[in-house]
């Protein structure tokens, strides 16, 4: 039961995270005009990964896409790439994890296949979350650098003659959405990886290792296995535990390969 819950929760958390990554990528408020210490203007500027917008006090909003590809800063291109890779990996991870869910029966899919799929989707979610966090962090770093560069006494303009106080930009809502979403996707991925360990079926476990004792032979087995004395029926690599039906919690208690040295 705990495995199903962990896997299900991991899936839901990742789903929310990826939805957030998509939302953040599409949002226009990656950077917003810094209003602190600025002359009060009747226009508010904000920028996204794909376009920049201006909202006038009158309520009229005008957005212009970045129609050039080569003219854009390399950092912006890198952030775009990271976010898209994050979305693609996350989407594939979601697709894989749907089939990996323990509560969903697909033909005669073995538990080992589900475990592998769960692990794969978990890794994909982790990488997806890291991509989003990296993308947002790179953009935030870019903003911080530009913020301190564009001080109030710096002027820009056509031919250097137009006195335009350079607009300073600060963190927009999309950055926070991206960080939270990336974190959720990462957490969801970790949960999927944890669930994978519990999903690993009995067939994948190592067999009991026999040790020759000085007196009579005893097959040593870690907790969870039935002890068996002598080699009689157990010398032909047969399973020594009962192969009958078990609850998910019982399956979890079986040793993994890491229990053996």
């Amino acid at each position: 039961m705990a495995v199903t819950a962990c896997q299900g929760l991991g899936f839901v958390v990742s789903l929310i995270g990826i939805a957030g990554i998509i939302a953040a990528t599409c949002m226009d408020q990656w950077s917003t005009q810094d209003l602190y210490n600025n002359p009060v203007t009747a226009v508010f500027n904000y920028q996204g990964l794909w376009r920049s917008c201006v909202r006038e006090s009158s309520g009229f909003t005008e957005c212009r896409g970045y129609f050039t590809l080569l003219g854009l800063p390399a950092m912006l291109q890198a952030v775009r790439a990271l976010m898209i890779v994050g979305i693609v990996l996350g989407a594939i991870g979601l697709l894989v994890s749907i089939f990996a869910l323990k509560c969903i029966r697909i033909g005669s899919m073995e538990d080992s296949a589900k475990a592998n799929m769960t692990l794969t989707s978990g890794i994909m979610f982790i990488v997806s979350g890291l991509c989003a966090i990296a993308g947002v962090s790179v953009f935030a770093n870019m903003l911080v650098t530009n913020f301190w560069m564009s001080t109030a006494n710096m002027y820009t303009g056509m031919g250097g003659m137009v006195q335009t106080v350079q607009t300073r930009y600060t963190f927009g809502a999309a950055l926070f959405v991206g960080w939270v979403a990336g974190g959720l996707t990462l957490i969801g991925g970790v949960m999927m990886c944890i669930a994978c360990r519990g999903l690993a079926p009995e067939e994948t476990n190592y067999k009991a290792v026999s040790y020759h004792a000085s007196g009579h032979s005893v097959a040593y087995k870690p907790g969870g296995f039935k002890a068996s004395t002598g080699f009689g029926s157990n010398t032909k690599n047969k399973k020594i535990y009962d192969g009958g039906a078990r609850t998910e919690d019982e399956v979890q208690s079986y040793p993994s390969k890491h229990d053996y040295v």
Partner: antibody, heavy 117, light 113 residues
Framework: QVQLKESGPGLVAPSQSLSITCTVS????????VSWVRQPPGKGLEWLGV???????NYQSALRSRLSIRKDTSKSQVFLKLNSVHTDGTATYYC???????????WGQGISVIVSS | DIVMTQSPSSLTVTARERVSMTCKSS????????????LTWYQQKPGQPPKLLIY???TRESGVPDRFTGSGSGTDFTLTISSVQAEDLAIYFC?????????FGSGTKLEIK
């Protein structure tokens, strides 16, 4: 079509309050801002203040302490109140709808107000 | 507050003549976000309320004849009437619509000979 009409007293005594109502039609006060402008006889235009669609207001620096603009969206009315008016308050008061570029694209006919005892 | 300076204060021209008037602001009205200048021109005929002619320094309001052209950027702006008509007799005001408060220029009075 868009229409704005100012109404209020034509005569106000000095040190009293001047209140003018602007009734609008053809647009919603939720979506658009309304500015107030006055023009003393034979002089230029003086911007007084604005109330935006979201209810935010901005005022002329010199009048900020004495001026207030509010609105009743349901009645499509905007109210201007100028406290303790002086004789220099004698002017034609206009209300105007604010559009693109924060420009005033539709104006009322104006109301002439005389400040005199 | 932003100071808007208009010149000349009055102009006397003959019909069909080309005329220009200028407006200078004490600070730039250029917004880098949308590459627009927040400068507006109004026309006020005698006994009438002002009428919007041009916004964003060069965008003509619908219904305004194309003989009216706005130009300029940053702090210096010009309103040009390519061929003055008798009905253009009016006072022309420029206004800052970028910084609060939205200050007006003192106006340029256009008279026809």
């Amino acid at each position: 079509q868009v229409q704005l009409k100012e109404s209020g007293p034509g005569l106000v005594a000095p040190s009293q309050s001047l209140s003018i109502t602007c009734t609008v039609s053809g647009f919603s006060l939720i979506n658009y801002g309304v500015s107030w402008v006055r023009q003393p006889p034979g002089k230029g235009l003086e911007w007084l203040g604005v109330i935006w669609g979201d209810g935010n207001t901005n005022y002329q620096s010199a009048l900020r302490s004495r001026l207030s603009i509010r609105k009743d969206t349901s009645k499509s009315q905007v109210f201007l109140k100028l406290n303790s008016v002086h004789t220099d308050g004698t002017a034609t008061y206009y209300c105007a709808k604010v559009g693109r570029g924060n420009a005033m694209d539709h104006w009322g006919q104006g109301i002439s107000v005389i400040v005199s005892s | 507050d932003i100071v808007m300076t208009q010149s000349p204060s009055s102009l006397t021209v003959t019909a069909r003549e080309r005329v220009s008037m200028t407006c200078k602001s004490s600070q730039s009205l250029f917004n880098s976000g949308n590459q627009r200048n927040y400068l507006t021109w109004y026309q006020q005929k005698p006994g009438q309320p002002p009428k919007l002619l041009i916004y964003w320094s060069s965008t003509r309001e619908s219904g305004v004849p194309d003989r009216f052209t706005g130009s300029g950027s940053g702090t210096d702006f010009t309103l040009t009437i390519s061929s003055v008509q008798a009905e253009d007799l009016a006072i022309y005001f420029c206004q800052n619509n970028y910084y609060y408060p939205f200050t007006f220029g003192s106006g340029t009075k256009l008279e026809i000979k």
